[in-house]
Interface confidence: medium
C-alpha cells in the first residue's frame, strides 16, 4: 500500500503533502484546509495538464468566503513545472487568504505572466522565499511577479536564481522590505550583486544576507551598496572566500554609518581584511584562520568581537600567553 | 572591565623630571596604540605623545628632545619621560589605549586613564 500523501500533525497547525505518483489524488489536500502551516511537495511534475482542469481567467471572488476562512498564513509549494498562467491563477485566490509566507522552491515557471487586472487585489504577504525557481521571463521575473504582490513585503530571499540579477527599470520600489536575503548565489559576485541591489528600490532595508554568493572583498561589497543607495544596519558577508587585501587602485570606499553588524565568519580569512567600517556593535570573525589574535589597529571599533574557531583560539594550537583566554571548547567550524 | 591607571604626577621645579606610569588591566588580549595627552583648564585635550605596538613613537612639536615615550608590551604598560619641564607643561596627563578585550565576548575601543596633575613651579 502506498503511504498517504498528505500528513496533518496532532495540533492540525502542520500539514505536509509529498506527491510523486505519476497522476496524483490532488483531493488528498483537502485534509490541510484546518493547517497554520502548509507544504506541497510535487514531485518534479508538470502542472501543465492542470489547466485544462481549471479556469485560470474565472472570477476569484467567487472562492473569496471560502477562501477567507482557511488557517493557513504560511505556504510552500515545491517540486513541479508550473505554467505562469496557473501560478496567477493560484496568487490571485490566494489574495484573499490570510496568507503572509510564502516559499517557492525547486519550480520551473514556464510562460509569461499576464499583467494585474485592474480590478485584482494583490497578494498581502510579508515574506517571499524563492529557491531554485527558474522564469522563462528572464530578468523581468521580479518585476512581473511584483505587480500581483501588494507593497507590504517586508522580508524577501532569493537563492539559487537562474537570473539573480533584476530588470530594474521594470521593479518598482519595495518600501517595506527590511530583510534582502541573496545567499546560496555562488555566481553574483560583486558585479552581480550591482546589478541585483537596483538602485533606490530598496529603500528600507535593514538586513542583508550575502552568503555564499561569490563576494570577494568587503570593500567591493562597500561599493555595490554605495552605488545602489542601500544602507543596511546587519550584513552577513559569511561563507564567502573572502580576500584580506583590497586591491590598491580601487577608491576607498565609505561605509554607511547605519551598520552595525558585520558577519565575516567562515570566510578563510588568515587575516583581518582591510577596509572595514570604522565602528560596529558586532563583528564576527569566527571559523576563519587568523593565526594570531587581531592587532587594535586591524579591527573596526567593536562592542561584540566574535573570534571563536580561530586556530590561535583552539586548544594545542594557541601561541606562548595566548592559552588563557582559551574556554576549552572547539566551536563546529 | 578594563581600566587604565597612571601614576607618577605631582609638583616640579622648572627644569627638573618626572617621569609618568600607566598600566592597562583587566581581561586583555592585546594593546594597539598607547599614548599620553594633556589638558589644561578651558582647554582642548592635546596629543603629547603615542607609540605603537612595535615601539614607532610620535611627538608633539613642543616636547621634541625632552620627552621619551616607551612601553612594556608584557606588562601592558606606558610610560613618559619628561625631562627639562617648563610651566608650560603643566596639564593634566592622561594615558590613553587602543585595547582588545574580552568581557562576554571580545570587544576593541579606546579607553582613557582619569589622569593624573602634573605642575611645573618656577
Known amino acids: 500500500t502506498t503511504p498517504e500523501p498528505c500528513e496533518l500533525d496532532d495540533e492540525d497547525f502542520r500539514c505536509v503533502c509529498n506527491f510523486s505518483e505519476p497522476q496524483p489524488d490532488w483531493s488528498e489536500a483537502f485534509q490541510c484546509v484546518s493547517a497554520v502551516e502548509v507544504e506541497i511537495h510535487a514531485g518534479g511534475l508538470n502542472l501543465e495538464p492542470f489547466l485544462k482542469r481549471v479556469d485560470a481567467d474565472a472570477d476569484p471572488r467567487q472562492y473569496a468566503d471560502t477562501v477567507k476562512a482557511l488557517r493557513v498564513r504560511r505556504l510552500t509549494v515545491g517540486a513541479a513545472q508550473v505554467p505562469a498562467q496557473l501560478l496567477v491563477g493560484a496568487l490571485r485566490v490566494l489574495a484573499y487568504s490570510r496568507l503572509k509566507e510564502l516559499t517557492l522552491e525547486d519550480l520551473k515557471i514556464t510562460g509569461t505572466m499576464p499583467p494585474l487586472p485592474l480590478e485584482a487585489t494583490g497578494l498581502a504577504l510579508s515574506s517571499l522565499r524563492l529557491r531554485n525557481v527558474s522564469w522563462a521571463t528572464g530578468r523581468s521575473w521580479l518585476a512581473e511577479l511584483q505587480q500581483w504582490l501588494k507593497p507590504g513585503l517586508k522580508v524577501l530571499s532569493i537563492a539559487q536564481a537562474h537570473s539573480p540579477a533584476f530588470s530594474c527599470e521594470q521593479v518598482r520600489a519595495f518600501p517595506a522590505l527590511t530583510s534582502l536575503d541573496l545567499s546560496d548565489n555562488p555566481g553574483l559576485g560583486e558585479r552581480g550583486l550591482m546589478a541585483a541591489l537596483c538602485p533606490h528600490k530598496f529603500p528600507a532595508i535593514q538586513n542583508l544576507a550575502l552568503r555564499n554568493t561569490g563576494m570577494e572583498t568587503p570593500t567591493g561589497v562597500c561599493a555595490a551598496l554605495a552605488a545602489a543607495g542601500v544602507q543596511p544596519h546587519s550584513l552577513d558577508l559569511s561563507h564567502n572566500s573572502l580576500r584580506a587585501t583590497v586591491n590598491p587602485s580601487a577608491p576607498r570606499c565609505m561605509w554607511s554609518s547605519a551598520l552595525n553588524s558585520l558577519n565575516l565568519s567562515f570566510a578563510g580569512l588568515e587575516q583581518v581584511p582591510k577596509g572595514l567600517p570604522a565602528k560596529l556593535r558586532v563583528l564576527d570573525l569566527s571559523c576563519n584562520r587568523l593565526n594570531r589574535a587581531p592587532q587594535p589597529d586591524e579591527l573596526p571599533e567593536v562592542d561584540n568581537l566574535t573570534l571563536d574557531g580561530n586556530p590561535f583560539l583552539v586548544p594545542g594550537t594557541a601561541l606562548p600567553h595566548e592559552g588563557s583566554m582559551n574556554s576549552g571548547v572547539v566551536p563546529a567550524c | 572591565q578594563v581600566q587604565l591607571q597612571e601614576s607618577g604626577g605631582g609638583l616640579v621645579q622648572a627644569g627638573g623630571s618626572l617621569r609618568l606610569s600607566c598600566v592597562a588591566s583587566g581581561n586583555i588580549r592585546s594593546v594597539g596604540d598607547m599614548g599620553w595627552y594633556r589638558q589644561t583648564l578651558g582647554d582642548q585635550r592635546e596629543m603629547v605623545a603615542t607609540?605603537?605596538?612595535?615601539?614607532?613613537?610620535r611627538y608633539a612639536d613642543a616636547v621634541k628632545g625632552r620627552f621619551t615615550i616607551s612601553r612594556d608590551n608584557a606588562k601592558s604598560a606606558v610610560y613618559l619621560q619628561m625631562n627639562s619641564l617648563n610651566r608650560e607643561d603643566t596639564a593634566v596627563y592622561y594615558c590613553?589605549?587602543?585595547?582588545?578585550?574580552?568581557?562576554?565576548?571580545?570587544?576593541?575601543?579606546?579607553?582613557w586613564g582619569q589622569g593624573t596633575q602634573v605642575t611645573v613651579s618656577s
Open positions: 607609540i605603537d605596538y612595535g615601539g614607532v613613537a
Open positions: 590613553n589605549a587602543d585595547i582588545l578585550y574580552k568581557s562576554d565576548s571580545y570587544a576593541r575601543r579606546e579607553f
